[in-house]
Amino acid sequence: EEELQVIQPDKSVLVAAGETATLRCTATSLIPVGPIQWFRGAGPGRELIYNQKEGHFPRVTTVSDLTKRNNMDFPIRIGNITPADAGTYYCVKFRKGSPDDVEFKSGAGTELSVRAKPSAPVVSGPAARATPQHTVSFTCESHGFSPRDITLKWFKNGNELSDFQTNVDPVGESVSYSIHSTAKVVLTREDVHSQVICEVAHVTLQGDPLRGTANLSETIRVPPTLEVTQQPVRAENQVNVTCQVRKFYPQRLQLTWLENGNVSRTETASTVTENKDGTYNWMSWLLVNVSAHRDDVKLTCQVEHDGQPAVSKSHDLKVSAHPKEQGSNTAAENTGSNERNIY
């Protein structure tokens, strides 16, 4: 009679993570008598997956009745497959021996490949806010996918970005892989409503890529522009001066009025108006009693935005020496304004 051969008809099997893998094996003869064992890998480090004779293998179920005396089919099913199960599986026939069974013949092996989906991409931006015209970096990470081939793209408001660098780790063979990408984005004043998107495409996703997003509102700081204007005299001896704080983001802002360098009033932006681009406007006004001033008054609107160094704009009020009985002892003149940093 021809010597027993162990046939593993499938050279390779591809299974999605979480599914069940079926590994087939057939012996061509009933002789010699002895059990079948399944191993993953070869050599001294091979791992016992199933022993027909003894042992407890909770993830493995047998497809046919292996206890039947004339059975020559020895397929197994391995449940809840993970990327860690990838490898070559060998069906091995043992010859009954005393005291121990002896390995008799091995099948050629079946390579089990596991397809695992990448995790949802996580996009993270810089730790500190940056102002328009600055370049900031965003990172995107996704883990646990297999096979290694993967495509990653970056978008800003639907427009594909080209300035990015991507790595897939590890470089060598592994049960699963991770991708890490860093993109550079130049901020503009209109980016409060902008979004950066990282898109990952993988064979397991059936053409429906995974996306991770970051809102630039978390990253951008748009510094305000200031304008100080003098309103017409509201009443005798009183001048209304306004400070227009425009196009700032985020909302956190504190304004201080100074009269000749002395703090007059400090307030926090509360009732702001929002612009279409997501930035804010705010106005503060100061009623100046010019009769209380002998000389010209320098009014300064000083703004501290989002914890940054203060910016300011000044306005000079000229106090004229008119006789009081004429009912107008003040002349207000806008002699220009300047913007400067106060540290």
Epitope: F39, G43, G45, R46, G97, D100, E103
Partner: antibody
Framework: EVQFQQSGTVLARPGTSVKMSCKAS????????MHWVKQGPGQGLQWIGA????????TYNQKFKGKAELTVVTSTSTAYMEVSSLTNEDSAVYYC???????????????WGQGTLVTVSA | DIQMTQSPSSLSASLGERVSLTCRAS??????LNWLQQEPDGTIKRLIY???SLDSGVPKRFSGSRSGSDYSLTISGLESEDFVDYYC?????????FGGGTKLEIN
């Protein structure tokens, strides 16, 4: 009781070969991989390779491929290692040890031979 | 190849003292690590297998543990016969590799 009896000390000339033995007793020889380990004078341990007596399947550390050749005679439960093209670098104590026919934690390198000292000298 | 970095390479200690030897694996080896003891005459004996399982006949003062990629052998209460050489060995992946060894000397 499991025991490995290794052959005695060898003094060899550079360029020649030596063949040492490791006789196993006390268990089924064919259920285990036989491994060989090198220890140079005052140095650490280096795994050379292993052989499976059932089918003479061998696996080597790349560093020792072409330098060491592993064989077995199952009828006498003896493993052999031949080291060829000897140089001073091959002067060492060579140990045999074993692991189970699959990766069973409890069976890795439990039992060791007493070692064979090889001295290469002109 | 997986590198096993063993530290310290030598250690002086006193009788009754508690000492720890460490091996760091360059790649993941799970729990597949042995600790071996080598006598001055060359005799090798396994003390610990699978990171923390004590071999039969090995005194309970020997114990093994793991923290991430660091594997430790602790001897609590050194006795005179413990002042010998110790090696770790990974058997997770071929080629199987040993740590450089630790020589434990009496103070």
């Amino acid at each position: 009781e499991v025991q490995f009896q290794q052959s005695g000390t060898v003094l060899a000339r550079p360029g020649t070969s030596v063949k040492m033995s490791c006789k196993a007793s006390g268990s089924t020889f064919t259920s285990y991989w036989m491994h060989w380990v090198k220890q140079g004078p005052g140095q650490g341990l280096q795994w050379i390779g292993a052989i499976y007596p059932v089918n003479n399947d061998t696996t080597y550390n790349q560093k020792f491929k072409g330098k060491a050749e592993l064989t077995v005679v199952t009828s006498t439960s003896t493993a052999y290692m031949e080291v060829s093209s000897l140089t001073n670098e091959d002067s060492a104590v060579y140990y045999c040890t074993r692991s189970f026919y699959y990766s069973l934690d409890a069976a890795w390198f439990v039992y060791w031979g007493q070692g064979t000292l090889v001295t290469v000298s002109a | 190849d997986i590198q096993m970095t063993q530290s310290p390479s030598s250690l002086s200690a006193s009788l009754g003292e508690r000492v720890s030897l460490t091996c760091r694996a360059s790649q993941d080896i799970g729990s597949r690590l042995n600790w071996l003891q080598q006598e001055p005459d060359g005799t090798i004996k396994r003390l610990i297998y699978a990171t923390s399982s004590l071999d039969s006949g090995v005194p309970k003062r020997f114990s093994g543990s793991r923290s991430g990629s660091d594997y430790s052998l602790t001897i609590s209460g050194l006795e005179s016969e413990d002042f010998v050489d110790y090696y770790c060995l990974q058997y997770a992946s071929s080629p199987f590799t040993f740590g450089g060894g630790t020589k434990l000397e009496i103070n």
